[in-house]
Interface confidence: medium
Amino acid sequence: AWELTILHTNDVHSRLEQTSEDSSKCVNASRCMGGVARLFTKVQQIRRAEPNVLLLDAGDQYQGTIWFTVYKGAEVAHFMNALRYDAMALGNHEFDNGVEGLIEPLLKEAKFPILSANIKAKGPLASQISGLYLPYKVLPVGDEVVGIVGYTSKETPFLSNPGTNLVFEDEITALQPEVDKLKTLNVNKIIALGHSGFEMDKLIAQKVRGVDVVVGGHSNTFLYTGNPPSKEVPAGKYPFIVTSDDGRKVPVVQAYAFGKYLGYLKIEFDERGNVISSHGNPILLNSSIPEDPSIKADINKWRIKLDNYSTQELGKTIVYLDGSSQSCRFRECNMGNLICDAMINNNLRHTDEMFWNHVSMCILNGGGIRSPIDERNNGTITWENLAAVLPFGGTFDLVQLKGSTLKKAFEHSVHRYGQSTGEFLQVGGIHVVYDLSRKPGDRVVKLDVLCTKCRVPSYDPLKMDEVYKVILPNFLANGGDGFQMIKDELLRHDSGDQDINVVSTYISKMKVIYPAVEGRIKFSTGSH
């Protein structure tokens, strides 16, 4: 028998520095977790103790903090090189700055293979990107070889900016011939490493003949065997075992997100490359694991230039940006409109001639808007200003919901109106009218939504059975502020870009902004 240790991360999202337990900015260092310096300590400890170790990343290193805003992926290449990753799969967020923003800082600079079997380049891009990412890579590990085959969510064109010269194929269809090729090369131990979410990971384990292990990402899935060590609730045991169509037991793993855990899976293979046993658990990277001093020093060096960024002007406002709780928790506020407009603008993807855009709607809990911005400071808006408005380090995500779920959400928005509670929704691409004289649960008297399958966008009544795409904070997608119906009834959820980054990019693009209160939210006569 031959034993392999797979160490894995996914959806790190720019958390190079240690973070608080909820993966936001570290405040009390003695309670902080993760970060590349701490990760390196644990990886090195395992490399010294065990003979056959692979360090893999399942995508979405890009996007999430000011590190990515400033360094644009160069930080990913630098620190992943320093940690000596063995391979990485491309995630959807790796395309957030377009193909160039992937090629220059990461693909050209990485000293490890970057993989995806279901992304095919065409046109002039094909020669430019040739060899910079691969469908698979055969890695020598001790006296053996291991094949790693990559995959990426085929939804990437709707979630990021890969452009028109990359085709995202069905994962299973694309993976099978690559795995077959590895078999003909006498590679009998094969890991599928990719970024399509836990459901697809399980399908790959079931359907792709010859895959021995699946290491996934995208859905931030936390798996654990036994008592979990922190706040995350396991979606199943680690590893999650799938019985393949040809009768094999295939372990599937994922390691939550944000570098909080290091996935740790031990696999035993027989001499024919069959998995005999698999066991392990994610390792919580808490403060009991010291940060490696050389990596920490490197982090401190890179930080020097970050601190200055937050005080630089992104753009100007010529109007007061009302982010006060007195406004945003009671009525339409122009800060809410600005943020929602930025959220929609960040998700403009013309992927189908029938649609002007794939999504037109935004909802945002008023309680998530934490500060106004005064225009009398020469109109200047800085990252620092925006960090006061959006201090929680969240993301603006894409979900699919039925109209009936949206109706419930808007009822919840005003079910206890008047108490300055955070669930009052700010909106974009939606016109809502409330009648507060009616009883809670029956206060939405009009709910019109902006069409997407149209050349001239207009507002149509919400249809209860229709499925709609909506951009919203991850806080709401996870049921925050009492929006349990969103969490329970959503049909699809894809994590998006860092909230501050979305708004800062929009302001930089617009240069001068003047959002108004324009009748998106109304109260019927006599009720308000």
Epitope: K72, E104, E109, A297, K301, K305
Partner: antibody
């Protein structure tokens, strides 16, 4: 081979604006900071500011903040430094330099342009 | 901003002697075991050339007779067995915080 090639000497009148270019080759332009440093005749070196071409992020010395603009054109791997409201004390050699901060040199300036002499005279 | 003071202003030595150049910072420029101090050589009509980075690391292609030391606020550039080609101005520079600043320079003359 890493190279930074600057534009030629300039003679300007007081109050005018000068824009100097710095074309780089031999490394990934977007992944390293470019710094601008000036040196008045017989004087020491003065750090003016820098730019991260990957994002366009800039830092300026407070002394020049209102007059200097540093930009970068990724398509041509060229950095620019523009200094406005010129006065006679701006007569100096202006250098662009690559910072090694993303490898091991930690913001030390590991490669320099040849310098551009700017003379401000009425 | 951090002010760097170099001494002496001028140093006149014979070939084969040792040069010791000093750079004092108005504030600590070291942290986590690293010192963000660098040394450059500049000859007339030429651009500066990096000699030493992070206080003590020799830049590739620089002869080993050059060395650097120091931590905190006091730093030294040493040139052993000085040669005629080492006649130049020498500048220190810190990168501990923005703005980065240079010392006023030390002129090294060879008799």
């Amino acid at each position: 081979e890493v190279q930074l090639v600057q534009s030629g000497a300039e003679v300007k009148k007081p109050g005018a604006t000068v824009k100097i270019s710095c074309k780089v080759s031999g490394y990934t332009f977007t992944s390293y900071w470019i710094t601008w440093v000036r040196q008045a005749p017989g004087q020491g070196l003065e750090w003016m500011g820098d730019i991260y071409p990957g994002s366009g992020n800039t830092n300026y010395n407070e002394k020049f903040k209102t007059r200097v603009t540093i930009t970068a054109d990724k398509s041509t791997s060229t950095a620019y430094m523009e200094l406005s409201s010129l006065r006679s004390e701006d007569t100096a050699v202006y250098y662009c330099a690559k910072e090694g901060g993303l490898t091991t040199e930690d913001y030390a300036l590991d490669y320099w342009g040849q310098g551009t002499l700017v003379t401000v005279s009425s | 901003e951090i002010v760097l003071t170099q001494s002496p202003a001028t140093l006149s030595l014979s070939p084969g002697e040792r040069a010791t150049l000093s750079c004092r910072a108005s504030k600590n420029v070291s942290t986590s075991g690293y010192s963000y101090m660098h040394w450059y050589q500049q000859k007339p009509g030429q651009a500066p050339r990096l000699l030493i980075y992070l206080a003590s690391n020799l830049e590739s292609g620089i002869p080993p007779r050059f060395s650097g030391s120091g931590y905190g606020t006091d730093f030294t550039l040493t040139i052993n067995n000085i040669e005629s080609e080492d006649a130049a101005y020498y500048f220190c520079q810190h990168s501990r915080e923005l703005p980065f600043t240079f010392g006023q320079g030390t002129k090294v003359e060879i008799k």
